[in-house]
Interface confidence: low
């Protein structure tokens, strides 16, 4: 399929102008290459009429232009003074020859319609209301008034002043006069449908003294707005149907031959194919609303319509707005996992791609909720605190320059299953949808922390160990202290690193962290995790309670600690102030080097983020064993 997109059918009338917009993929080559508009001949040859290289054919001289808009990845062909000879098949395309990338456009130019003299032309969209104005002389002030529709030679009455209404106009047509006006009456026809189009005659009086007016009513199908979007990106349908339907249920549907299948409506209906990737948001009290769809797929391409009706379903004679969505498969947005699986008690690390040109943009992670319209409240982000219920188990790790950030969620429960969105405050096309599936665990977790009853005493030394299996032998192990703006890496000591990898002893693979001396602000959540470079793996979390040195101080069991963590005031969860007077015990120099490197990486981005990069140990009292 060609990645060039434009309007399939363009129609106009003689003497008028048309403006045709063609879309192309946003690449440097495409922005600079030749753009052309050619006419398809019977012999299969496409004769250039105008191109961006400055060529202009004789028949287009003085009446056409081609303008490239590289910032929008579009080019526009304007053609004026149309004649019926312009009817035909055309191509808009890119490339040095007319056989390159193109899109077929059909142009139809029709004659100016001929109406009887003094015909007033009314042009209205489907679903709207027309008010036809009928003038008469004073002599017919008390005579019968009527409106009829021409069908061949006959004129069938639509409505008259005796209160007759044609059944097909029932509840849609009214005849009235305004105020004290004695020379004009009006007919309103609402909920217009295509078959209402045609020539109408309004009449006051009978016989030769009757006053007659001709009215031509044109009922327009909505002209679809073209939307060109990349695979895996997102699209927003902005729907403005007017005040008259402000209180009716709204919907977005997708055209399917003769029907239009509802994708989402404000009554809670939602197509399962869009589960987890759609939001409908009312914009104001005037009936405006928008529908956002993320994670665009090839099969999402097609014709869409929004509308309003009390049933929340498409109804003939109600206003609609239309779009044609093209999904460009030559996407710059990388393919990422759409389903991530985890087990209860375990963890997941979700990689979120973003536009690498926008590394300083703010990153967010939100949980799509299937309320009636769908919504996506932020759970964590750079400069956004972790939401309630996620304290101690959710962190966002930015990796500046890599074009991705990682979100880690641990202590998983089956309630965490659902859809999540990765997003930034920058390029809104780079929104990705992930489905998290959490199953019941069937075996022990890979990472285990001892002691599980983690209570440290102020002023004393406290060591906590994380046991890992041999499969993590070659990966980097770390401890970090969780706070509301991330999980900050601490110096730690890997017991297993000293052994030969050939003889990995499953029971003695330990990475430990020591708090020495323990301070009140050391209380909180700590994570043990594994990673390979910028790729984060499994994590486990433990809450360390800190208590005063008292005789016979009671131990807090881990479940109480977790409960306390949930109730702890937000202030306690914030990062403590930097302390540089900690004991620096003997450390493997390799660990020191790693730590310094991490510290620097963290410092560069320190104030651009509120989540920890695989970040600094500053602000923690952790030192190694």
């Amino acid at each position: 399929q060609s990645p060039i997109f434009g309007p399939q059918d363009v129609s106009s009338i003689e003497g008028n102008s048309v403006s045709i917009t063609c879309y192309y993929p946003d690449t440097s080559v495409n922005r600079h290459t030749r753009k052309y508009w050619c006419r398809q001949g019977a012999n299969g040859y496409c004769a250039t009429l105008i191109s961006s290289n400055g060529y202009l054919s004789k028949e287009y001289s003085g009446r056409a232009s081609l303008i490239n808009f590289p910032e929008n990845s579009t080019f526009v062909i304007n053609i004026a003074h149309l004649t019926q000879e312009d009817t035909g098949s055309y191509k808009c395309g890119l490339g040095t020859t007319n056989r390159g990338l193109f899109f077929d456009v059909s142009l139809e130019v029709s004659q100016v319609p001929e109406f009887p003299n003094d015909t007033h032309v009314y042009t209205k969209d489907i679903g709207r209301t027309v008010t036809i104005e009928c003038r008469f002389k004073e002599g017919n002030a008390h005579s019968k008034k009527s409106l009829c529709k021409k069908r061949g030679e006959a004129c069938e009455v639509v409505i008259d002043s005796t209160e007759y209404v044609d059944p097909s106009y029932k509840d849609r047509a009214i005849l009235f006069m305004k105020g004290t006006s004695r020379d004009i009456f009006y007919v309103n026809i609402s909920h217009l449908i295509p078959s209402d189009a045609g020539l109408y005659v309004c009449q006051a009086g009978e016989g030769p003294s009757a006053d007659k007016n001709n009215a031509d009513l044109q009922v327009l199908e909505p002209e679809p707005e073209l939307l060109y979007k990349d695979l895996r990106s997102s699209v927003t349908f902005e729907c403005d149907l007017g005040r008259e339907v402000a209180n009716d249920a709204k919907y977005l549907c997708r055209k399917n031959k003769e029907t239009c299948d509802v994708i989402i409506n404000t009554l809670g209906k939602r197509d399962p194919a869009f589960e987890g990737r759609i939001l409908l948001t009312p914009r104001d009290d005037n009936g405006r609303f928008s529908v956002l769809i993320t994670g665009l797929r090839k099969e999402d391409a097609g014709h869409y319509q929004c509308g309003a009706h009390s049933s929340g379903l498409p109804q003939e004679g109600w206003p609609v707005q239309a779009w044609q969505l093209f999904v460009n498969e030559e996407s710059t947005i990388p393919n990422s996992r759409s389903v991530v699986k985890g087990v209860t008690g375990g963890s997941v690390a979700i990689v979120c791609p973003y536009n690498p040109k926008e590394s300083s943009s703010l990153k967010y992670w939100c949980h799509w909720e299937a309320d009636e319209n769908g919504r996506c409240p932020v759970l964590v982000g750079t400069q956004a605190l972790v939401q309630e219920g996620y304290e101690g188990r959710l962190a966002l790790f930015d990796q500046p320059g890599s074009g991705a950030y990682t979100v880690i969620l641990n202590q998983l429960t089956t309630q965490d299953s659902g859809f999540y969105w990765c997003l930034t405050d920058g390029d809104s096309r780079w929104r990705t949808t992930i489905e998290l599936q959490v199953a019941e665990a069937t075996k022990k977790p890979d990472l285990e922390v001892t002691p599980q009853n983690a209570t440290a005493v102020i002023g004393e030394t406290f060591t906590i160990s994380c046991h890992y299996p041999c499969k993590f032998y070659s990966q980097e192990k770390y401890w970090c202290k969780w706070s509301n703006d991330g999980c900050h890496i601490l110096p730690s000591h890997d017991e297993g690193a000293r052994q030969s990898s050939v003889s990995c002893d499953q029971s003695s693979q330990i990475v430990s962290m020591t708090l020495n001396p323990v301070k009140k602000e050391d209380e909180g959540w700590y994570w043990c995790g594994v990673k390979e470079g910028q790729v984060y793996g499994e994590t486990t979390a433990i809450y360390v309670a800190v208590e005063e040195r008292t005789r016979g101080s009671p131990h807090i069991n881990p479940t109480d600690a977790n409960a306390r963590a949930k109730d702890a005031p937000e202030e306690e969860a914030m990062e403590s102030s930097v302390r540089e007077d900690e004991n620096k015990a003997n450390l493997d120099p390799r660990l020191f080097a790693d730590e310094r490197e991490i510290q620097n990486a963290g410092d560069q981005a320190q104030e651009n983020r509120a989540s920890g990069n695989a970040g600094s140990a500053g602000g923690q009292s952790g030192s190694s064993k």
Partner: nanobody, 121 residues
């Protein structure tokens, strides 16, 4: 659309105080973060302090102990009390608000016009 209006900038002596105020108006549901940034000529805007929707405050090291961020009851006004001002604090101070938009499925960032703070030694 959201508008941010700053006030309170001006000239202060080194060691003196100034109070900056920022009010958000327009279509506001819930402001997730309100912050003050500052910028000196030729440098990028840098964060000074911010307050989150649950009233947790965060200060950069240079602001700790000298600057205090507070928010009005309606949560749409934030004040930055700057004490013990130093010549290095001279800059244009910008108010920043971040508001989650369900409609766009993203966090929208808004900026004020900026207010100039001059510190004479």
């Amino acid at each position: 659309e959201v508008q941010l209006v700053e006030s309170g900038g001006g000239l202060a002596q080194a060691g003196g105080s100034l109070r900056l105020s920022c009010t958000a108006s327009g279509t506001i549901s819930k402001i997730d973060v309100m912050a003050w940034y500052r910028q000196t000529p030729g440098n990028e805007r840098e964060l000074v302090a911010r307050i989150f929707s649950n009233d947790v405050t965060h200060y950069v090291d240079s602001a700790k102990g000298r600057f205090t961020l507070s928010r009005a009851q309606d949560k749409n006004t934030v004040d930055l009390q700057m004490n013990s001002l130093e010549p290095d604090d001279a800059a244009v101070y910008y108010c920043n608000a971040q508001i989650w938009s369900d409609m766009r499925g993203r966090m929208d960032t808004y900026w004020g016009q900026g207010t100039l703070v001059t510190v004479s030694s």
